[in-house]
């Protein structure tokens, strides 16, 4: 079997979707004639070398766009970035590429995405909306870290 990424769509609990704007992912309320991104995701093939019970380690990209989500420090602050990268190139690497990996945890219909490189930091959107996706340590009211992931088959 040849492993291939799965495709999915994401929205948060406020029904905002992810859209690409100037090479940045932002969360906005869904409207007509809007084209939300389709997510590409694939599990890390070296799962046995990563932490157990934190979720399923996945690479997360934008389907058909050769862009993947990664975490990098800017100064002392972990930040979420989009990098030009083929998700299958990451998948095939001989070691987990931690900066591009996220622990995907599901609780009911809610999904969270925790950075493998920066444990305790989660993909989030500001509760205000219309803002770029960020990484946060604060799982409170200011940021939303719970997302609905619908797989597309």
């Amino acid at each position: 079997k040849i492993d291939t990424p799965q495709r999915g769509s994401i929205q948060d609990i406020n029904h905002r979707v992810w859209v690409l704007q100037d090479q940045t992912l932002i969360a906005v309320p869904r409207k007509d004639r809007m084209s939300p991104v389709t997510i590409a995701l694939i599990s890390c093939r070296h799962v046995e070398t990563l932490e157990k019970d934190r979720g399923n380690p996945i690479y997360l990209g934008l389907n058909g766009l050769n862009l993947c989500l990664m975490c990098a420090k800017v100064g002392d602050q972990p930040t979420l970035q989009l990098k030009e990268k083929d998700i299958m190139d990451l998948y095939n690497q001989p070691e987990p590429v931690k900066s591009f990996l996220f622990y995907h945890s599901q609780s009911g219909r809610n999904s969270t995405f925790e950075s493998v490189a920066f444990p305790g930091w989660f993909i989030a959107v500001s509760s205000e909306g219309g803002c770029p996706l960020i990484l946060t340590q604060e799982l409170g009211k200011a940021n939303t870290t719970d997302f609905g992931l619908t797989m597309l088959f």
Partner: antibody
Framework: QVQLVQSGAEVKKPGASVKVSCKAS????????IYWVRQAPGQGLEWIGR????????RYDPKFQGKATLTTDTSTNTAYLELSSLRSEDTAVYYC??????????????WGQGTLVTVSS | QAVVTQEPSLTVSPGGTVTLTCRSS?????????ANWVQEKPGQLFTGLIG???DRAPGVPARFSGSLLGGKAALTLSGAQPEDEADYFC?????????FGGGTKLTVL
């Protein structure tokens, strides 16, 4: 600057154990993978295994499973290789190396100076 | 376990081109073997040259290039310099473990 400094040469008797250290500076070992490699006199390189210092998971070449144990102390930014039940065939220079992802691939970008372990009765 | 074989020694003239190869006992080397090349100069630390078959490590001169050639991993040195005289080792990935070759002693003469 980035450096890996290994402990000094050791002379051990057959059946004994030895622990070699590899102290990193200029980077945090939790941000990368530390590999261990050996070179016996007049021979090529042999991969022993690797450790992910952030979570402690290891991989070993099947030949070294049970012979080598890799650990780290992240508080001192140091990686360790322990070899047990030493035999004369374990006489070699042991190297630690950083295996790091940069741009699009993993590279062995920095190496320690090597530690000579001599096993002799 | 796989055996990785390199030319024991090669000689190149200053300014010349030489190709070092890395053969796998299991068959053709592919991009899935993620060939790495490292250099050892006398009295100096090892240096990583190539990762992922053909990606030069940061700071490595452009005269070094990695490729696949006739079912083997290859390291080509174009415009050899006296300071390139060294031992060169390749390493190939096989699933979850890494196997090094015996090394090639390159003389620039």
């Amino acid at each position: 600057q980035v450096q890996l400094v290994q402990s000094g040469a050791e002379v051990k008797k057959p059946g004994a154990s030895v622990k070699v250290s590899c102290k990193a500076s200029g980077f945090n070992i939790k941000d990368t993978y530390i590999y261990w490699v050996r070179q016996a006199p007049g021979q090529g390189l042999e991969w022993i295994g690797r450790i992910d210092p952030a979570i402690g998971t290891t991989r070993y070449d099947p030949k070294f499973q049970g012979k080598a144990t890799l650990t780290t102390d992240t508080s001192t930014n140091t990686a360790y290789l322990e070899l047990s039940s030493l035999r004369s065939e374990d006489t070699a220079v042991y190297y630690c190396a950083r295996y790091d992802y940069s741009g699009s691939s993993f590279y062995f970008d920095y190496w320690g100076q090597g530690t000579l372990v001599t096993v002799s009765s | 376990q796989a055996v990785v074989t390199q030319e024991p020694s090669l000689t190149v003239s200053p300014g010349g081109t030489v190709t070092l190869t890395c053969r796998s006992s299991t068959g053709a080397v592919t991009t899935s073997n993620y060939a790495n090349w490292v250099q050892e100069k006398p009295g100096q630390l090892f240096t990583g040259l190539i990762g992922g078959t053909n990606d030069r490590a940061p700071g490595v001169p452009a005269r070094f290039s990695g490729s696949l050639l006739g079912g083997k991993a290859a390291l080509t040195l174009s415009g050899a310099q006296p300071e390139d005289e060294a031992d060169y080792f390749c390493a190939l990935w096989y699933s979850n473990h890494l196997v090094f070759g015996g090394g090639t002693k390159l003389t620039v003469l």
